[in-house]
Amino acid sequence: ARARNGDHCPLGPGRCCRLHTVRASLEDLGWADWVLSPREVQVTMCIGACPSQFRAANRHAQIKTSLHRLKPDTVPAPCCVPASYNPMVLIQKTDTGVSLQTYDDLLAKDCHCI
């Protein structure tokens, strides 16, 4: 079971691990040579700090938090990463024309600390 402790950010609003959206063009993403559409993507990603027990993904993340407090030089704090993803379909260039391809790990759906 996921021990998703604490959705209250002690660092202040918007400072802790959360979903963030950035509008990006195919050129920004480096996809222009193989993707035709969409020409712009609302990229959802996970950003922010992971203070003690905030959105801990599992017990390992809780242990990591505790050890980071004791040994910050050797144990890093948990990282804010996607907990799940939204699928996305792209129209791609192929040798013979164009095709559809679906990707299940491009866009973050929600975030946690691990």
Epitope: L36, S37, P38, R39, E40, Q42, N86, P87, M88, V89, L90, I91, V98, L100, T102, D104, L107, K109
Partner: antibody, heavy 119, light 110 residues
Framework: EVQLVQSGAEVKKPGESLKISCKGS????????IGWVRQMPGKGLEWMGV????????IYSPSFQGQVTISADKSISTAYLQWSSLKASDTAMYYC????????????WGQGTLVTVSS | QSVLTQPPSVSGAPGQRVTISCSGS????????VNWYQQLPGTAPKLLIY???NRPSGVPDRFSGSKSGTSASLAITGLQAEDEADYYC??????????FGGGTKLTVLG
Amino acid sequence: EVQLVQSGAEVKKPGESLKISCKGSGYSFTSYWIGWVRQMPGKGLEWMGVIDPGGSYTIYSPSFQGQVTISADKSISTAYLQWSSLKASDTAMYYCARYGRYGTYFDYWGQGTLVTVSS
Amino acid sequence: QSVLTQPPSVSGAPGQRVTISCSGSSSNIGVLYVNWYQQLPGTAPKLLIYSNDNRPSGVPDRFSGSKSGTSASLAITGLQAEDEADYYCQSWDSSSNYVFGGGTKLTVLG
């Protein structure tokens, strides 16, 4: 309010040509793909193909490749589905539908255009 | 023959809970998402659930979706007369792109 308004019902003879339309409003027409879906009488939904109205890229279901042509005119926010030679088996309700942001589902649908092909 | 398999019909009395199944394979539901559409008699389909378990705004929380392995389910609780409709699941298949189930006719008894 997002709306997709399709052209009216058509009655045609086998061998005739036809072009039906789907006009989008209430959103940026070039920012969302448009798909076409067939529903034969008393049957289920079948995906026919998709167009990106911004770049006019089209991709067809293998079942409909070469049978129909999908196009769009972004200047009037309209997508089209056309046949060069209709068959009786083309008799069906045809729906246009807008794709959601990630291209994985259809979030808005037109009211449908009934095409009847009979001699 | 649809790539996704649904029961042709299900029924339930008002207030009851009913589920509609959608069975696929490792090339569609098994690795990707499922969406559900409701088609009321004589009308166009309407998006009911997307990406397995998300409801668009305006869809009552009586409707919920889930996915496990190569199958998905649509659950309707507190069944109402106006829920009588055809329900379609839809996913992605590596060979034929967007695929629909054959549809399930929901009858509200009484």
